[in-house]
């Protein structure tokens, strides 16, 4: 590794450092598909952006391998807990990789939000936040799933979101 | 961009990298003003610090433009949910910018913590955590608001806090 | 600081930047000791890793001083709230330092998860997430404690975890 090589490497690193991969995707009316697939996200409007990461059908797609802090928050809410809706909500971040046929659980939370309804009000709100560092290879994808997604409240992109940045 | 220029830029970057902007502000007795304004924070004592960011009247003020992971946690608690105190709590991070007259919602959570009181105990505790990546320009500010702030419990700076770092 | 020195420093920084300290530790069957000590963690299998940080008896041990974003999530769950179990759960990140005999609270949450049980189901789930930036010196340690740890549900390492990265 001669001086010129090192120099090029440093210049290269400076440029790549300027675009340390990061993304923040926001909830939108189209986020809940009801198809059993992952949540879909807004990637450009408002607070949403992609920098050094790409997006495909609900997934953040890694272009540069490394350790990433990935996170998601979902806003949950309802009026009582209708029969047929699970009283346990599962909110998770999952990895898709060409090396395995099935999604791999990365970070998961289970909550029982309906217990938040009070005797004077059947309306309840709850929020679930997940965040943690995982290693992701180029081409791997991360998605968000919520079961039962009918309890996710979207509104304006500030209450339910999904993001990542390289650490 | 000659070698000397690149060299200066790299030296500069090394120095700026040493002070990657970061801050962690903690809750204090003076945090809750009751004035309808944002929460106020401790910036120096104990675990609190500012590095490459400044503070003004509850706001983290950006000095270097870029993408920041901003976060806040508030500890909520009470004895029952007295009438007139909102049974829905809204905890949010908001941006102030010279370009708009009103605050802009960045990250928001709604919770119904009073439902956590049980038949055997009217005492309840709940916690709300928010975190996400947003782009901030130099001079823009981020504040934390909680409605109803009377449900926020402060104590010692470890339970309610507000921070950010550049990614 | 001559050109050669600066060059060495930059090379050094590039190498150290490649190993920006980070870790993600996951919950395992052995995590809950019942001894009154901190939770123990998996450091190698599955999603767990250590990079530029070490581990000792439940603690992340800092090798390079600096500001770190530290985080932990614990999955809580139960069937009702048995008598003798505190209805308030405390989940916290604590620092151990050679300079003080006692652990120092860094980030703490209190929750009353049992209130999430509903009239139709005594089963409840809840999750507690903590994250924030703290300054850590080389040799200092961070641990996770949950009181009462009997309400922590482990399963597969995705629901309860502990991590950090330098910012």
């Amino acid at each position: 590794d001669g001086p010129a090589g090192s120099w090029e490497q440093l210049i290269q690193e400076r440029r790549s450092h300027e675009v340390n991969p990061a993304a923040h995707l926001t909830g939108a009316n189209s986020s809940l598909t009801g198809s059993g697939g992952p949540l879909l996200w807004e990637t450009q409007l408002g607070l949403a952006f992609l920098r050094g990461l790409s997006y495909h059908d609900g997934a953040l797609v890694v272009t540069k391998a490394g350790y990433y802090y990935i996170y998601s928050k979902v806003q949950l809410g309802g009026v009582g807990c209708p029969l047929g809706l699970a009283s346990t909500i599962t909110h998770g971040l999952y990895k898709r990789t060409p090396r395995y046929p099935e999604e791999l659980e990365l970070l998961v939370s289970q909550q029982s939000p309906c217990g938040r309804a009070t005797s004077s009000s059947r309306v309840w709100w709850d929020s679930s936040f997940l965040g943690g560092v995982v290693h992701l290879e180029a081409g791997e994808e991360v998605v968000v799933r919520v079961l039962d997604e009918r309890l996710v409240r979207l509104r304006d992109g500030t209450r339910s979101y999904f993001g990542a940045f390289m650490v | 961009d000659g070698p000397a220029g690149s060299w200066e830029q790299l030296i500069q970057e090394r120095r700026s990298h040493e002070v990657n902007p970061a801050a962690h502000l903690t809750g204090a007795n003076s945090s809750l003003t009751g004035s309808g304004g944002p929460l106020l924070w401790e910036t120096q004592l104990g675990l609190a610090f500012l590095r490459g960011l400044s503070y003004h009247d509850g706001a983290l003020v950006v000095t270097k433009a870029g993408y920041y992971y901003i976060y806040s946690k508030v500890q909520l608690g009470g004895v029952g949910c007295p009438l007139g105190l909102a049974s829905t709590i809204t905890h949010g991070l908001y941006k102030r910018t010279p370009r708009y007259p009103e605050e802009l919602e960045l990250l928001v959570s709604q919770q119904s913590p009073c439902g956590r009181a049980t038949s055997s105990s009217r005492v309840w505790w709940d916690s709300s955590f928010l975190g996400g990546v947003v782009h901030l320009e130099a001079g823009e500010e981020v504040v934390v608001r909680v409605l109803d702030e009377r449900l926020v419990r402060l104590r010692d700076g470890t339970r309610s806090y507000f921070g950010a770092f550049m990614v | 600081d001559g050109p050669a020195g600066s060059w060495e420093q930059l090379i050094q920084e590039r190498r150290s930047h490649e190993v920006n300290p980070a870790a993600h530790l996951t919950g395992a069957n052995s995590s809950l000791t019942g001894s009154g000590g901190p939770l123990l963690w998996e450091t190698q299998l599955g999603l767990a890793f250590l990079r530029g940080l070490s581990y000792h008896d439940g603690a992340l041990v800092v090798t390079k001083a600096g500001y770190y974003y530290i985080y932990s999530k614990v999955q809580l769950g139960g069937v009702g709230c048995p008598l003798g179990l505190a209805s308030t759960i405390t989940h916290g990140l604590y620092k151990r330092t050679p300079r003080y005999p006692e652990e120092l609270e860094l980030l703490v949450s209190q929750q009353s998860p049992c209130g999430r049980a509903t009239s139709s189901s005594r089963v409840w789930w809840d999750s507690s997430f903590l994250g924030g930036v703290v300054h850590l010196e080389a040799g200092e340690e961070v641990v996770v404690r949950v009181l009462d740890e009997r309400l922590v549900r482990l399963r597969d390492g995705t629901r309860s975890y502990f991590g950090a990265f330098m910012v």
């Epitope: - | 608690g77 009470g78 004895v79 007295p82 009438l83 007139g84 449900l151 104590r155 | -």
Partner: antibody, heavy 121, light 111 residues
Framework: QVQLVQSGAEVKKPGASVKVSCKAS????????VHWVRQAPGQGLEWIGA????????SYNQKFKGRATLTADKSTSTVYMELSSLRSEDTAVYYC??????????????WGQGTLVTVSS | EIVLTQSPATLSVSPGERATLSCKAS??????????MNWYQQKPGQPPRLLIY???NLESGIPARFSGSGSGTEFTLTISSLQSEDFAVYYC?????????FGQGTKLEIK
């Protein structure tokens, strides 16, 4: 300044109902609870319940639930307490009081002048 | 419900002297460092007047000779130097649990 002005004394027969009013002024009516407390002659104070004028929510002492009804009229900044199925032991001075909060701890920082309700056959 | 017991029922003190009134709760009224106990003064023919809220906070406009202390189940109202206008009945009241309850009162009379 904050003022709570109550309606005048009432004499009622057992089994009847009484409705006492409390007109608020000097503060934002919809931002504070109004509580009702009674005091039998020569006795101590007893909490009846409270109403939140902002949305009409109420909270009652179980002892009075079903007999006491608390309501608020935002248009006139007036709160009402109706007590039905009156008995002689309901003879008391009835006070309205504004409820303030320190965190979730409530206290009564302004009181009406009181309304004497006499139940006698 | 939480029962509040005040003692003594009657307290005779001379003007200028210190008066100490006690209130005991049947269970703790503490939460997170706050005690949900309040004190009121009532004179004949008048409504009660708030003196102290949350055990030790002096209500605006109340003279500094009044102070409150205590936690858990035991609380005290102290009047450091009695003035003639202080002779009245004093009630403690808890707001920890519905129904809110009052003590039976302590009558402070001139000795």
């Amino acid at each position: 300044q904050v003022q709570l002005v109550q309606s005048g004394a009432e004499v009622k027969k057992p089994g009847a109902s009484v409705k006492v009013s409390c007109k608020a002024s000097g503060y934002t009516f919809t931002s504070y609870n109004v509580h009702w407390v009674r005091q039998a002659p020569g006795q101590g104070l007893e909490w009846i319940g409270a109403v939140y004028p902002g949305n009409g929510d109420t909270s009652y002492n179980q002892k009075f639930k079903g007999r006491a009804t608390l309501t608020a009229d935002k248009s006139t900044s007036t709160v009402y307490m109706e007590l039905s199925s009156l008995r002689s032991e309901d003879t008391a001075v009835y006070y309205c009081a504004r409820g303030s909060y320190y965190y979730t701890s409530s206290y009564f920082d302004h009181w009406g002048q009181g309304t004497l309700v006499t139940v006698s056959s | 419900e939480i029962v509040l017991t005040q003692s003594p029922a009657t307290l005779s003190v001379s003007p200028g002297e210190r008066a100490t009134l006690s209130c005991k709760a049947s269970q703790s009224v503490d939460f997170d460092g706050d005690s949900y106990m309040n004190w009121y003064q009532q004179k004949p023919g008048q409504p009660p007047r708030l003196l102290i809220y949350t055990a030790s906070n002096l209500e605006s406009g109340i003279p500094a000779r009044f102070s409150g202390s205590g936690s858990g189940t035991e609380f005290t109202l102290t009047i450091s130097s009695l003035q003639s206008e202080d002779f009245a009945v004093y009630y403690c009241q808890q707001s920890y649990e519905d129904p809110f309850t009052f003590g039976q009162g302590t009558k402070l009379e001139i000795k």
